[in-house]
Interface confidence: low
């Protein structure tokens, strides 16, 4: 049969190049000498020359490291012709998936996030949501799965755990009672986003929470 199994290649491969991936083989080679070629994006059209084929053996070659964040799947066509140039097989689809390495850190969408909440609210009240992105894969692997955490809170009054952050959604909520604008009008939280679902690379940003007045003080004359 004129087939090749779909191929998976890790991105950022170290080589040496060219690297043999898989062998195209037509069973018509029993009857006549076969010459192999490949076409498609990554072979003879942009980005040209990423893949090649050994004309007489059918070995599919990778010529350089791949970047999944640029192109995650290549689709090439394999061709087999006899010595006189006549096609001996229909073009064959060759599917090459680029598998992910954790080569990107998370990035917060803003350096500083701002939110506000009324003083005296109950624990569990949502304040704001922060977002970080990671270009790595988050479907097949945890490389691009971001976990959020609060690194520090300033000031630490009335204590240092006034807020919590949902590890997967980035929603910041009040976790403790005692928010009092007259004492602390604003909190600065240093927040972290860590890929590998919390076990990888970390990046930080700032979340500023303004405490709004609930008009809870009687006027003084």
């Amino acid at each position: 049969d004129w087939v090749v199994a779909p191929i998976s290649v890790p991105e950022n491969g170290k080589g040496p190049f060219p690297q043999r991936l898989n062998q195209l083989k037509s069973n018509k080679d029993r009857d006549t000498k076969i010459f192999y070629s490949i076409t498609g994006p990554g072979a003879d059209s942009p980005p040209e020359g990423v893949f090649a084929v050994e004309k007489e053996t059918g070995w599919l070659l990778l010529n350089k490291p791949l970047d999944r964040e640029e192109i995650a799947k290549y689709e090439l066509f394999g061709h087999a012709v006899s010595e006189n140039g006549a096609s001996v097989e229909d073009p064959m689809n060759i599917s090459i998936i680029v598998t992910d390495q954790n080569d990107h850190k998370p990035k917060f969408t803003q350096d500083t996030f701002r939110g506000s909440v009324l003083e005296g609210v109950l624990p569990g009240t949502s304040v704001m949501q922060v977002t970080a992105t990671d270009e790595d894969d988050a479907i097949y692997t945890y490389n691009g799965v971001v976990a959020y955490s609060i690194h520090s809170q300033e000031p630490k009054d009335p204590h240092d755990l006034m807020f919590t952050i949902h590890r997967s959604t980035g929603t910041i909520s009040v976790i403790s009672s005692g928010l009092d604008r007259e004492k602390v009008p604003e909190y600065t939280l240093t927040i972290q986003a860590t890929d590998m679902d919390g076990d990888g690379s970390t990046t930080t940003a700032v979340a500023v929470v303004e405490i709004l007045d609930a008009n809870d003080n009687a006027p003084m004359f």
Epitope: A5, P6, I7, S8, P41, P46, P47, R68, E69, E70, I71, A72, K73, E75, N93, S95, I97, V98, T99, E135, D137, I139, Y140
Partner: antibody, heavy 118, light 112 residues
Framework: QVQLQESGPGLVKPSETLSLTCTVS????????WSWIRQPPGKGLDWIGY???????NYNPSLKSRVTISVDTSKNQFSLKLSSVTAADTAVYYC????????????WGQGTMVTVSS | DIVMTQSPLSLPVTPGEPASISCRSS???????????LDWYLQKPGQSPQLLIY???NRASGVPDRFSGSGSGTDFTLKISRVEAADVGVYYC?????????FGGGTKVEIK
């Protein structure tokens, strides 16, 4: 969140070129595949082609000779041109986003009806 | 091209009852990476299609857990454990293993 909006003329004359633009708002055009899909009245869905933000394209062979998909990253837009149209090209045209390497269309535009008629 | 065949063409359902749609591909959609490149979409009346299931069995964000996808290779099934009135529309399967990406002909789900 990310939204897609198709725009372009609703009526095109036979033999002319159909031109549509899809504007991506609420997110970047980078790191995704951007496709055009069409649906003739009362029929199923047909994939036209995709463009990757790095400008790699892939077209349905049934339309390849007539289709061009291009991207303008500075405007966060991608476009479809379909030349030499006939009545058979009358359809609702959707733009859609596919996650890198997964190829499932997770976000769709609302679609725009294009009629080919003189 | 990979040909996708859905059955049934039309599926009358009773709210609260289960429903099942079949999709068959003309060649295996199982990639050596271990995933089936098969997606399910629902097109509600007058709306764009929406993604329900990707890579054979993964529910898309916001999709209720009454929807589930199963199968491998060439035979796939979409199941709705308890149909609701909001589930009416045309369901499409699509193969994403290789281009041209191809859709099934659709299954119209309607309330009895």
């Amino acid at each position: 969140q990310v939204q897609l909006q198709e725009s372009g003329p609703g009526l095109v004359k036979p033999s002319e070129t159909l031109s549509l633009t899809c504007t991506v708002s609420g997110g970047s055009i980078s790191s995704y595949y951007w496709s055009w899909i069409r649906q003739p009245p009362g029929k199923g869905l047909d994939w036209i082609g995709y463009i990757y933000y790095s400008r790699t394209t892939n077209y349905n062979p049934s339309l390849k000779s007539r289709v061009t998909i291009s991207v303008d990253t500075s405007k966060n837009q991608f476009s479809l041109k379909l030349s030499s149209v006939t009545a058979a090209d009358t359809a609702v045209y959707y733009c859609a986003r596919a996650r890198n390497g997964i190829d499932a269309f997770d976000i769709w535009g609302q679609g725009t009806m294009v009629t080919v008629s003189s | 091209d990979i040909v996708m065949t859905q059955s049934p063409l039309s599926l009358p359902v009773t709210p609260g009852e289960p429903a099942s749609i079949s999709c068959r591909s003309s060649q295996s959609l199982l990639h050596s990476y271990g995933y089936n490149y098969l997606d399910w979409y629902l097109q509600k009346p007058g709306q764009s299609p929406q993604l329900l299931i990707y890579l054979g069995s993964n529910r898309a964000s916001g999709v209720p857990d009454r929807f589930s996808g199963s199968g491998s290779g060439t035979d796939f099934t979409l199941k709705i454990s308890r149909v609701e009135a909001a589930d009416v529309g045309v369901y499409y399967c699509m193969q994403a293993l290789q281009t041209p990406l191809t859709f099934g002909g659709g299954t119209k789900v309607e309330i009895k």
